[in-house]
Amino acid sequence: YETKMDLVQTSEVMQESLYPAAQLCPSFEESEATPSPVLPDIVMEAPLNSAVPSAGASVIQPSSSPLEASSVNYESIKHEPENPPPYEEAMSVSLKKVSGIKEEIKEPENINAALQETEAPYISIACDLIKETKLSAEPAPDFSDYSEMAKVEQPVPDHSELVEDSSPDSEPVDLFSDDSIPDVPQKQDETVMLVKESLTETSFESMIEYENKEKLSALPPEGGKPYLESFKLSLDNTKDTLLPDEVSTLSKKEKIPLQMEELSTAVYSNDDLFISKEAQIRETETFSDSSPIEIIDEFP
């Protein structure tokens, strides 16, 4: 598979999100073959004592609240949806344009990413990988991710890649076997990789393309739905560039428990028109033949 990795950080909270096209986030539902492993909470360092430029495209989260600069108590209990809609393919993305000015540290906002997938029938789930590293002053889009059909509250080891589901109706298998999660090299030159694309008169940052196909399936949560996940990343480009001294190396910080957040999905058919309105703004919408992944970080 081809790997283009972008390390995304928000206010010294470094998140490395690996999103294979049509990937599946492991679901440790009850299974005779594979007992549910007991894993610790995903931890995420979060020094919250400085302001950073906020750039990129973010979906407005009306219910979100800013992080207190002096507070590290933002354990977020995520609730994956029980009943996302099953539409096929084509879905639009509403983006909030950010000018890149320095502002107070807020909770990571979502951006909707739409990645193009070539093979439609795969069911997939996007999972947020939260890394115990810090990177300061890079534009910080957080991936808003549409996924489906699995309870995903178990943590995922650092630097691990997700595996896509190429068999929608197969039984769950153990994703966490040694050979199913290749390590991501932790190289310094990979910590700040910006892949710029140009789509519909907009320059996009943080392109992540993965094609990794393995059989994997998860039982849906109550009322859950299967979805197609094909993505083309659509991010607003900030016109501000980074200063060299704004990029810092990765460092270990105090660990704060953080659970996986809610996953939700919608998939649409080619001829379908998807209308998405954010609570406070209406933006032009980007359409693709596939469904975006949405990962929502909630920090009370």
Epitope: P85, D169, S264, V267, S276
Partner: antibody
Amino acid sequence: EVKLLESGGGLVQPGGSLKLSCVVSGFDFRRNWMSWVRQAPGKGLEWIGEINPDSSKINYTPSLKDKFIISRDNAKNTLYLQVSTVRSEDTALYYCVRPVWMYAMDYWGQGTSVTVSS
Amino acid sequence: DVLLTQTPLTLSITIGQPASISCKSSQSLLHSDGKTYLNWLLQRPGQSPKRLIYLVSKLDSGVPDRFTGSGSGTDFTLKISRVEAEDLGLYYCWQGTHFPQTFGGGTKLEIK
């Protein structure tokens, strides 16, 4: 016991606006997509739109996208529907719905009636 | 939008007799995941709609087994093996495979 209780309906003049509410109990509102569906007198059901659990994604049926704004307050377990510039054809029973396409039961409120008349 | 056409518009059935309602879609409701997201709803007089069947043929809990759903692609059928008095009302098919969700126009089941 699952309950979806709509309110806010009533008589409204053409060109006016109103905000419908739906208070939910009996299931985890924060984990559910929610929808609004309406039914004009003697007519069939019409899907208005839906909102995902954290309000980051809101879908509307294309022909109605400029008339309605769906929102929610998870702290209050409440779903909202803002109806703007109402016309006579907006006269209907408005249902709050927890739609489910597989496995779990879906839930419908009892509906709140909106009458547009001068 | 996907158009769901229900026939007949009205169905007058004697209690104990079978009934059949058709729902035809303007395009296939088969999802790429292999599932077909078609629900059947019953709206009894003065009540809210209630789902009877999901995924074409799966009965909701509490729904009598005299109701059966069948079909694939664009043609779907709801059958009642023996109509009972409580079955009267409006029946709707409802698709979720394509955006936006759409309902059929409804079929009114009357008791003779």
